[in-house]
């Protein structure tokens, strides 16, 4: 269900802000443009207002995509998709953001964690990920490699591996050489998701072969 | 490669300004990561001073709140200092140097060579 | 402000020593820490980050370690090149802050 609305919103944060305290599809508006696109807003967690740049829940979506579908997204906001680097990049450059990420894994667990700083550089530096200010339960240890690395896609290779990480894992992420995260890998059902190099990985909580249920990435201002 | 060049007067007066230039080279100061000013006492003490971001935002440290102005020359590539009413105290070697994250404190990877600088009259 | 105290001040070693040199830290820096090596003359030079890593291009007989309050940085096998002044800095919460540094000095 599409919401609308003839108010121009950056994020999902503005969004809560102007009274819309449901959780749903939201158009936001382009930092210091016209450009639009639709994001799905989380208006009940941890005090509402994230924009969800990630959702990963049942492999109805292919994530092996090239360079320009991450720049501008793909996927439903709905259900499985990725935002896009370039409006997550402009918006990351505006103001401070946090950036949390909660997985699931097959056994009923859920864990998370929370980066008090984020931002994506612009795609002339390879919407390269810095991170700072790490908590939560998914590992005191960052999952991504830090300093941040630049981004990969299968026609994108950005990475320190001297082979491609992307085409090896699939999926484009910050991949170092290759990492111990890759929230963009092969989905795999229950009962094929152990021993999987190539899953969807989250090494300082699960483990370098365990591929997770489901995981989303979602970003809110810092002074939220 | 990243280089960084700090460059400015020895000696200043007590009550005056300093005033000092950092000189990157490499790496467009408005593409990424911060740049620090850090200073060393006698004694080696190091304190940071505070930065200015890739995207112009400042942040400086509490105890030269008052005093302190970091501004940049992006067209130059440069970012300067600026330190008022100093005093002997101040009297330092003076570095410039990149860190690692453009919004908020971090490790600094790429540092100058240092300028020396004395407050007497 | 977090207080990072640096133990010892002074280390007298001998080429091919362990030497181990640890920094506590006022209250949880997390693992936002780094490691630098000053030698005479020169600047500040990055060797850890994020209290574990090695940055580019350091030897590996250079180690550190720690979470929150405790962090230790150790040579394997010093070498004569390793004189120097060794700071930890914290960039956990602003402003970051360093230790008094650790000098270390070959017999």
């Known amino acids: 269900d599409y919401k609308d609305d003839d108010d121009k919103f950056r994020d999902c944060a503005e969004v809560f802000k102007s009274g819309h305290t449901t959780n749903g599809i939201y158009t936001l508006t382009f930092p210091n443009s016209t450009e639009e696109i639709k994001a799905y807003c989380d208006m009940e967690a941890g005090g509402g207002g994230w924009t969800i740049i990630q959702r990963r829940e049942d492999g109805s979506v292919d994530f092996q995509r090239t360079w320009k579908e991450y720049k501008v997204g793909f996927g439903n906001p709905s259900g499985e998709y990725w935002l896009g680097n370039e409006f997550v990049s402009q918006l990351t450059n505006q103001q401070r953001y946090v950036l949390k990420i909660h997985l699931k894994d097959w056994e009923g667990n859920e864990a998370y964690s929370l980066y008090e700083h984020f931002y994506l550089s612009s795609e002339e530096l390879n919407y390269r990920i810095h991170l700072k200010g790490l908590t939560g339960t998914a590992g005191k240890i960052s999952s991504i490699s830090q300093p941040g690395n630049d981004f990969s896609t299968k026609d994108g290779d950005n990475d320190k591996c001297i082979c491609k990480c992307s085409q090896m894992l699939t999926g484009g992420w910050w991949f170092d050489a290759c990492g111990p995260s890759n929230l963009n890998g092969m989905y795999y059902p229950q009962r094929q998701n152990t021993n999987k190099a190539n899953g969807i990985k989250w090494y300082y909580w699960k483990g370098s072969g365990y591929s997770l249920k489901a995981t989303t990435m979602m970003i809110r201002p810092a002074d939220f | 490669d990243v280089q960084l060049q700090e460059s400015g007067p020895g000696l200043v007066k007590p009550s005056q300004s300093l005033s000092l230039t950092c000189t990157v080279t490499g790496y467009s100061i408005t593409s990424d990561y911060a740049w620090n000013w850090i200073r060393q006492f006698p004694g080696n003490k190091l304190e940071w001073m505070g930065y200015i971001s890739y995207s112009g935002s400042t942040s400086y440290n509490p105890s030269l709140k008052s005093r302190i102005s970091i501004t940049r020359d992006t067209s130059k590539n440069q970012f300067f200092l600026q330190l008022n009413s100093v005093t002997p105290e101040d009297t330092a070697t003076y570095y410039c140097?990149?860190?690692?994250?453009?919004?908020?404190?971090?490790?600094?990877?790429?540092w100058g060579q240092g300028t020396s600088v004395t407050v007497s009259s | 402000s977090i207080v990072m105290t640096q133990t010892p001040k002074l280390l007298l070693v001998s080429a091919g020593d362990r030497v181990t040199i640890t920094c506590k830290a006022s209250?949880?820096?997390?693992?936002?820490v780094a490691w630098y090596q000053q030698k005479p003359g020169q600047s500040p030079k990055l060797l850890i980050y994020y209290a574990s890593n090695r940055y580019t291009g350091v030897p590996d007989r250079f180690t550190g370690s720690g979470y929150g309050t405790d962090f230790t940085f150790a040579i394997s096998t010093v070498q004569a090149e390793d004189l120097a002044i060794y700071f930890c800095?914290?960039?956990?919460?602003?402003?970051?802050?360093f230790g008094g540094g650790t000098k270390l000095e070959i017999k």
């Open positions: 209250q949880s820096a997390s693992n936002d």
């Open positions: 140097a990149r860190s690692t994250f453009g919004h908020y404190v971090s490790s600094m990877d790429y």
């Open positions: 800095q914290q960039d956990y919460s602003s402003p970051p802050t």
